[in-house]
């Protein structure tokens, strides 16, 4: 039981994780490094001409559960992988485009490394 006056709200996690960012660098990033309370990610997408586009950055803790889970999008391909184990861990993530199947791709698992 909490003592009277003791806060039940969790204390905010400090921004402890640094990630490489490319195309998704916030305004305050320096040397292509961003900081987050959540996850680092690397993402691969297919552009209109079918070429792969690889980008990376930081994800806040809030909402990262669904960001780090491959959610289908129509008529195009996209895959994302997330990690937290060390600073700049997303340098070592290498997501691959999912196979084309029935115009969109099959639900994927949550990708954490």
């Amino acid at each position: 039981k909490k003592e009277d006056g003791e806060s039940t709200a969790p204390t905010p996690r400090p921004k402890v994780l640094r990630c490489k960012c490319h195309h998704h660098c916030p305004e305050d990033s320096v040397n292509n490094i961003c900081s987050t309370d959540g996850y680092c990610f690397t993402m691969i997408e297919e552009d209109d001409s079918g070429l792969p586009v690889v980008t990376s950055g930081c994800l806040g803790l809030e909402g990262s559960d669904f960001q780090c889970r491959d959610t289908p999008i129509p008529h195009q391909r996209r895959s994302i992988e997330c990690c937290t184990e060390r600073n700049e861990c997303n340098k070592d993530l290498h997501p691959t485009l999912p196979p084309l199947k029935n115009r969109d791709f099959v639900d994927g698992p949550i990708h954490h490394r």
Epitope: H23, H24, C25, P26, E27, C34, F41, M43, E45, E46, D47, D48, V53, T55, G57, C58, L59, G60, F66, Q67, T71, P72, I73, P74, Q76, R77, R78, I80, N102, R103, D104
Partner: antibody, heavy 124, light 107 residues
Framework: QVQLVQSGAEVKKPGASVKVSCKAS????????MHWVRQAPGQGLEWMGM????????NYNENFKSRVTMTRDTSTSTVYMELSSLRSEDTAVYYC?????????????????WGQGTLVTVSS | DIQMTQSPSSLSASVGDRVTITCRAS??????LNWYQQKPGKAPKLLIY???RLHSGVPSRFSGSGSGTDFTLTISSLQPEDFATYYC?????????FGGGTKVEIK
């Protein structure tokens, strides 16, 4: 937390233009598509188009294509929707809505976070 | 454009009731169907995306199902805060289109 704050209500004459702003905070502005959706009084929702703040790439609903322009200012994390040649049927609440998924080039269709809405009244 | 048809357009229900709303697309939209809740004077809120995935913070009494052209939103046990208007939206093909809405009122 994600916040989208829109500009205030506007009253316009038929034939005029209106420019509605949507200032984003609480996330990396350049990483998500921003959509614009409108709702006439007592009516349903109508998707107007979308803009990617990083590239400035846009997709417009053909119903508005000749009259709508969506722009962004990355220095202030703000997107804008301008509608020209206004008519009485354009009287509506205009919403910006951020997409759910991070995207760079692919188009994503999930309207996860919404602004509070801007009422535009067109009346002579 | 893909037409989205919701039924019923309105319904009356009591707290604790199981409520089902249907949405039909004029052509196959795979599973790219989202549901939104809107209360008077407020912006819509995303409830369910990609047919059945709950958005962050949405109570588990909301669920979605379907595929192709026919979709369903179910509220397993209606709560006082669930009285609102619900819209479906297809995300398969541009332009994205919404259903006409279903107003859930207190019986």
């Amino acid at each position: 937390q994600v916040q989208l704050v829109q500009s205030g209500a506007e009253v316009k004459k038929p034939g005029a233009s209106v420019k509605v702003s949507c200032k984003a905070s609480g996330y990396t502005f350049i990483s998500y598509w921003m959509h614009w959706v409108r709702q006439a009084p007592g009516q349903g929702l109508e998707w107007m188009g979308m803009i990617h703040p990083n590239s400035g790439s846009t997709n417009y609903n053909e119903n508005f294509k000749s009259r709508v322009t969506m722009t962004r200012d990355t220095s202030t994390s703000t997107v804008y929707m301008e509608l020209s040649s206004l008519r009485s049927e354009d009287t509506a609440v205009y919403y910006c809505a951020r997409d759910l998924l991070i995207a760079t080039v692919v188009v994503t269709p999930y309207f996860a976070y919404w602004g509070q809405g801007t009422l535009v009244t067109v009346s002579s | 454009d893909i037409q989205m048809t919701q039924s019923p357009s309105s319904l009356s229900a009591s707290v604790g009731d199981r409520v089902t709303i249907t949405c039909r697309a004029s052509q196959d939209i795979s599973n790219f169907l989202n549901w939104y809740q809107q209360k008077p004077g407020k912006a819509p809120k995303l409830l369910i995306y990609y047919t059945s995935r709950l958005h962050s913070g949405v109570p588990s009494r909301f669920s979605g199902s379907g595929s192709g052209t026919d979709f369903t939103l179910t509220i397993s046990s209606l709560q006082p805060e669930d009285f609102a208007t619900y819209y479906c939206q297809q995300g398969n093909t541009l332009p994205y289109t919404f259903g006409g809405g279903t107003k859930v009122e207190i019986k």
